[in-house]
C-alpha cells in the first residue's frame, strides 16, 4: 500500500514538474527588465528563451521571435538544449511511469518488469529535473553577469551631459517557476526510485537461514537472466544457484510460489 | 467616429478645487487611456496625468499631491480634479484619447479661469 | 523628469522652403526592446488644439501629408517640412512618451513671410 502510494504520489508530483518546466520554457518572462533606475518607464521589456516582448502601459504588448539560430548566444541556445532535453525526458518518463503504476493492470506484466519501469522512469524524472534546474542557474548566472556589467556601464553618453540609460534584466518569473518545477521533478524521481525497491518481488527470507537442496537439479528462478538496468535491489537480476544460506538482511519479500524447491 | 469633449466651470476661486468631465463617443474606455493636458494662455502645453484602461493612473510630478483622475466606463467620462487652485493653474483643459502612448485624439479644451 | 529642448524657438520662413527643427532630450528615447524611439511630434494651429503629426520619432500618422517627415534616435530628433505650405503656420511642439511623465518641449513657432 505505501509503495503504491509512493509510486503513485511520485508519479503526480513529477507530473506538475514537469508540466512547469515546460510552461517555463514557454514562458516570455525569463528576463524582466530592471526598474530600479527607471521605475517611471511606460515601456517595459522583459525576454524569454524564443522571443522578446515590450508591453506598453497602454496595455498593448508587442513580441518578436528571434528568428536568428545562429546570431543568438551560445548560453542562450545551451538553455534551450537543456530545457527541450529536460521536457523529452520527462515526458518519456511519464509515459513508461504510466505502465508502471501497481494501480494500473496491463495484461499479465509482471511485477518486476513494473519495478524496472518505476525505476527508469525515476531516473528519466531526475536526469529531466537536473538539466531543467541546470538550465534555468545557467541562465539566471548570465543575467547576473550581464547586469554588473551593464551597471559598470550605467551612464555613458556625451561628455557625461546626456544620460543614456541601459536597459538592465533582472531574474524573470519563468526562472523561479523553472526552478520549482525542477525540484519537484527530481523529487518526484526519487520517489519514484524508492517505490521501485519496495516493487521488486524477492526471495523470501526466513528468520534464520533457508537452506535449498542441493543437488543435480539445479533451480532457476522464472526469468532468470532479465534485461535491467544496473541500478537497485541486485536479487532479482541473477540465477540463483544457492546451494548455500542466505543472510537476513536480505530485504524481506513475501515468499511465491516459486521459492520453494 | 471617435470624440471628446471636456466641460468644466469655467470660472474658479484661488484655493478652490477644480473639477472637469471628458466625455467620450465612439472607442471604449476599457481599451484606451485618456491623457489631461494644459495650456496656459500663450504657453505651451503641459501635461498633467493619464488613466489607463485598468484605471491606474501616472500624474505629472510637480502636480501629483493635487491632481486626481478618474472614470466611469459605463458613462464614458473620465474625471480630472485638481485642488487648492492658483492663478497659474488659468489654462485651456483638453482631454485627448492615447494610441500606443501618443494622442491621437484631442477634444476641443474648456477654458478655466482662476480668479476671484 | 525628462526635459525636451526645442530648437529654434520661433522660426519665420517663405512658403516652399524646407523647414527643419530639432528637440533634444536629457535622456534617451530608444527603448532597447523593440529599437523605438518613444518621441512625439504635434501640430497646433491657432484656436485649435494640438493634432498627432508623427510618433515613434519617424512614423507619420495616417493623413498627415508626406511633407513631414520626423528622424532621429536616442536623445537628437528632427522634424522636417520639405516644402512648406501657408497651412503649416503652427506651433510644433516634441513629447516624450517613454518615461512619466510625459513632457512636452517648449515649442517651435513657425511664421510664414
Known amino acids: 500500500m505505501a509503495v503504491t502510494a509512493c509510486q503513485g504520489l511520485g508519479f503526480v508530483v513529477s507530473l506538475i514538474g514537469i508540466a512547469g518546466i515546460i510552461a517555463a520554457t514557454c514562458m516570455d518572462q525569463w528576463s524582466t527588465q530592471d526598474l530600479y533606475n527607471n521605475p517611471v518607464t511606460a515601456v517595459f521589456n522583459y525576454q524569454g528563451l524564443w522571443r522578446s516582448c515590450v508591453r506598453e502601459s497602454s496595455g498593448f504588448t508587442e513580441c518578436r521571435g528571434y528568428f536568428t539560430l545562429l546570431g543568438l548566444p551560445a548560453m542562450l541556445q545551451a538553455v534551450r538544449a537543456l530545457m527541450i532535453v529536460g521536457i523529452v525526458l520527462g515526458a518519456i518518463g511519464l509515459l513508461v511511469s504510466i505502465f508502471a503504476l501497481k494501480c494500473i493492470r496491463i495484461g499479465s506484466m509482471e511485477d518486476s518488469a513494473k519495478a524496472n519501469m518505476t525505476l527508469t522512469s525515476g531516473i528519466m524524472f531526475i536526469v529531466s529535473g537536473l538539466c531543467a534546474i541546470a538550465g534555468v542557474s545557467v541562465f539566471a548566472n548570465m543575467l547576473v553577469t550581464n547586469f554588473w556589467m551593464s551597471t559598470a556601464n550605467m551612464y555613458t553618453g556625451m561628455g557625461g551631459m546626456v544620460q543614456t540609460v541601459q536597459t538592465r534584466y533582472t531574474f524573470g518569473a519563468a526562472l523561479f517557476v523553472g526552478w520549482v518545477a525542477g525540484g519537484l521533478t527530481l523529487i518526484g524521481g526519487v520517489m519514484m526510485c524508492i517505490a521501485c525497491r519496495g516493487l521488486a518481488p524477492e526471495e523470501t527470507n526466513y528468520k534464520a537461514v533457508s537452506y535449498h537442496a542441493s543437488g543435480h537439479s539445479v533451480a532457476y528462478k522464472p526469468g532468470g537472466f532479465k534485461a535491467s538496468t544496473g541500478f537497485g535491489s541486485n536479487t532479482k537480476n541473477k540465477k540463483i544457484y544457492d546451494g548455500g544460506a542466505r543472510t537476513e538482511d536480505e530485504v524481506q519479500s513475501y515468499p511465491s510460489k516459486h521459492d520453494y524447491v | 467616429q471617435v470624440q471628446l469633449k471636456e466641460s468644466g466651470p469655467g470660472l474658479v476661486a484661488p484655493s478652490q478645487s477644480l473639477s472637469i468631465t471628458c466625455t467620450v463617443s465612439g472607442f471604449s474606455l476599457t481599451s484606451y487611456g485618456v491623457h489631461w493636458v494644459r495650456q496656459p494662455p500663450g504657453k505651451g502645453l503641459e501635461w498633467l496625468g493619464v488613466i489607463w484602461p485598468g484605471g491606474n493612473t501616472n500624474y505629472e510630478s510637480a502636480l501629483m499631491s493635487r491632481l486626481s483622475i478618474s472614470k466611469d466606463n459605463s458613462k464614458s467620462q473620465v474625471f480630472l480634479k485638481m485642488n487648492s487652485l492658483q492663478t497659474d493653474d488659468t489654462a485651456m483643459y483638453y482631454c485627448?484619447?492615447?494610441?500606443?502612448?501618443?494622442?491621437?485624439?484631442w477634444g476641443q479644451g474648456t477654458s478655466v479661469t482662476v480668479s476671484s | 523628469d525628462i526635459v525636451m529642448t526645442q530648437s529654434p524657438s520661433s522660426l519665420t520662413v517663405t512658403a516652399g522652403e524646407k523647414v527643419t527643427m530639432t528637440c533634444k532630450s536629457s535622456?534617451?528615447?530608444?527603448?532597447?526592446?523593440?529599437?523605438?524611439?518613444?518621441l512625439t511630434w504635434y501640430q497646433q494651429k491657432p484656436g485649435q488644439p494640438p493634432k498627432l503629426l508623427i510618433y515613434?520619432?519617424?512614423t507619420r500618422e495616417s493623413g498627415v501629408p508626406d511633407r513631414f517627415t520626423g528622424s532621429g534616435s536616442g536623445t537628437d530628433f528632427t522634424l522636417t517640412i520639405s516644402i512648406l505650405q501657408a497651412e503649416d503656420l503652427a506651433v510644433y511642439y516634441c513629447q516624450n512618451d517613454y518615461s512619466y511623465p510625459f513632457t512636452f518641449g517648449s515649442g517651435t513657432k513657425l511664421e510664414i513671410k
Open positions: 535622456q534617451s528615447l530608444l527603448n532597447i526592446g523593440n529599437q523605438k524611439n518613444y
Open positions: 485627448a484619447r492615447d494610441r500606443r502612448l501618443a494622442m491621437d485624439y
Open positions: 515613434w520619432a519617424s
